[in-house]
């Protein structure tokens, strides 16, 4: 069971730069609540000297990245997936996560999110061209196939508890963080609140309950006067720079 499983947490705000992604620090190991079985690819490996970072889904990558196989046709047939730089507007896409913040995937192309045109939650039909080179693609012949999907597009900022894809989807003072098997808008941490210190280089993975990063002018540091026998269990809080 999960009692003995360690899942690596990923930094939400900043991640190391795989193939041109945003810079920052990846995660430290955290344990997950008992009573649930978690099955995920190779998330428990530590890849200290390995760049770019492997992933199983978009949520494990930074806000300017998405998870995919670097070579066409490899995904879905056991190919290694890594965090790739997001695609800018007018580039080909299969799903929203492939497009850079401020854009969404419409008709297989990354388009700018136009707040004036779509109310929150408007549902729009998108024809997605599936080239078989992404982890959502079916394993098989590598021939192009077209799939009609329906895209739920949010054009107002998410409030606390709203489902999100990246922090730019959330209102001010909130970030997009993992909760259970989804990602939701959670409050950015205030001074004195417990934070997760991401210190092990390259231990890039998944955490079932993610905290946001510390707010403006704050850093996640070991709490003063908090000395414990185990280095790894020291309490970190958001503190003034």
């Amino acid at each position: 069971t999960l009692n003995s499983v360690l899942i690596n947490s990923n930094a939400i705000k900043n991640l190391p730069p795989p193939l041109g992604g945003a810079g920052g620090q990846p995660g430290s190991a955290v344990s997950v609540a008992p009573g649930v079985l978690y099955e995920g690819g190779n998330k428990y490996q530590t890849l200290d000297n390995y760049q770019p970072y492997p992933c199983a889904e978009d949520e494990e990558c930074g806000s300017d990245e998405y998870c995919s196989s670097p070579s066409r046709g490899a995904a879905g047939v056991g190919g290694v997936q890594i965090c790739l730089a997001c695609r800018k507007r007018r580039k080909r896409c299969m799903r929203h996560a492939m497009c850079c913040p401020g854009n969404y995937c419409k008709n297989g192309i990354c388009m700018p999110s136009d707040h004036s045109h779509f109310p929150r939650g408007e549902i729009e039909e998108s024809i997605i061209e599936n080239l078989g080179n992404d982890h959502n693609a079916a394993a098989g012949d590598g021939y192009p196939r077209r799939t009609t999907l329906t895209s739920k597009i949010y054009h107002t900022k998410g409030q606390e508890g709203s489902v999100c894809l990246r922090s730019s989807d959330c209102a001010a003072g909130l970030c997009c963080a993992r909760h259970f098997w989804s990602k939701i808008c959670k409050p950015v941490l205030k001074e004195g609140q417990v934070c997760t210190k991401h210190k092990r280089k390259g231990s890039h993975g998944l955490e079932i309950f993610q905290r946001c990063y510390c707010g403006e002018g704050l850093a996640c540091r070991i709490q003063k006067d908090h000395h414990q026998a185990s280095n790894s269990s020291r309490l970190h809080t958001c503190q003034r720079h």
């Epitope: 649930v36 895209s151 508890g161 489902v163 989804s182």
Partner: antibody, heavy 117, light 111 residues
């Protein structure tokens, strides 16, 4: 319109197997986590399994090793493969998802399973 | 697991009056600045419908008559004024910890 339609329920003997399906439409299926929740004849609701958009799976102790949740992101179908079924698995099985907020805000109509000899 | 205890198990309220259902958790369901408590309504032969999430936020298309309140481990759902159509089972559910758990339900009848 968001639609979740379950199928595959029926009568099965203890120790038997069954595979449930949930056909999803009206949203980008691959972007969202999906779950199975069951309701016992006594009307008690129980979480059964969940799967993230990328395919990571989660189970409670009561079903792990017996049930397997999976998804087909091309055909937009969620599955629940159930084996070693017990009488206490008798329930209405619903598939559900969280599209707008973290809670399960969309549910299918359910499919009924009876485990009895 | 977090145990949710709902009370009363059933209640009958006159049309136009106030119905209050309570849900107590075995431990706090607050985390990350959010109370992870939800309320569902279920009518006979139908799936549960989300009414309230994050203790007090209304789900899509839910009338303002349904109000959620509380934090920590004590929560309540208030329906006012009660309408004929509100006859149903009401469940609380926590999403703070895995496994997510549900209360035993409260049956509301309209007099």
């Amino acid at each position: 319109e968001v639609k979740l339609v379950e199928s595959g329920g029926g009568l099965v003997k203890p120790g038997g197997s069954l595979k449930l399906s949930c056909a999803a439409s009206g949203f980008t299926f691959s972007n969202y986590a999906m779950s199975w929740v069951r309701q016992t004849p006594e009307k008690r609701l129980e979480w059964v399994a969940s799967i993230s958009g990328g395919g990571d799976t989660y189970y409670p102790d009561s079903v792990k090793g017996r049930f397997t949740i999976s998804r087909d992101n091309v055909r937009n179908i969620l599955y629940l493969q159930m084996s070693s079924l017990r009488s206490e698995d008798t329930a209405m099985y619903y598939c559900a998802t969280s599209l707008e907020n973290y809670a399960m805000d969309y549910w299918g109509q359910g499919t009924s399973i009876t485990v009895s000899s | 697991d977090i145990v949710l205890t709902q009370s009363p198990a059933s209640l009958a309220v006159s049309l136009g009056q106030r119905a209050t259902i309570s849900c107590r958790a075995s431990e706090s369901v607050d985390d990350f600045g959010i109370s992870f408590m939800n309320w569902f309504q279920q009518k006979p032969g139908q799936p549960p419908k989300l009414l309230i999430y994050a203790a007090s936020k209304q789900g899509s298309g839910v009338p303002a008559r349904f109000r959620g309140s509380g934090s920590g481990s004590d929560f309540s759902l208030t329906i006012h004024p009660v309408e004929e159509d509100d006859t149903a089972m009401y469940f609380c559910q926590q999403s703070k910890e895995v496994p997510p758990t549900f209360g035993g339900g409260t049956k509301l009848e309209i007099k």
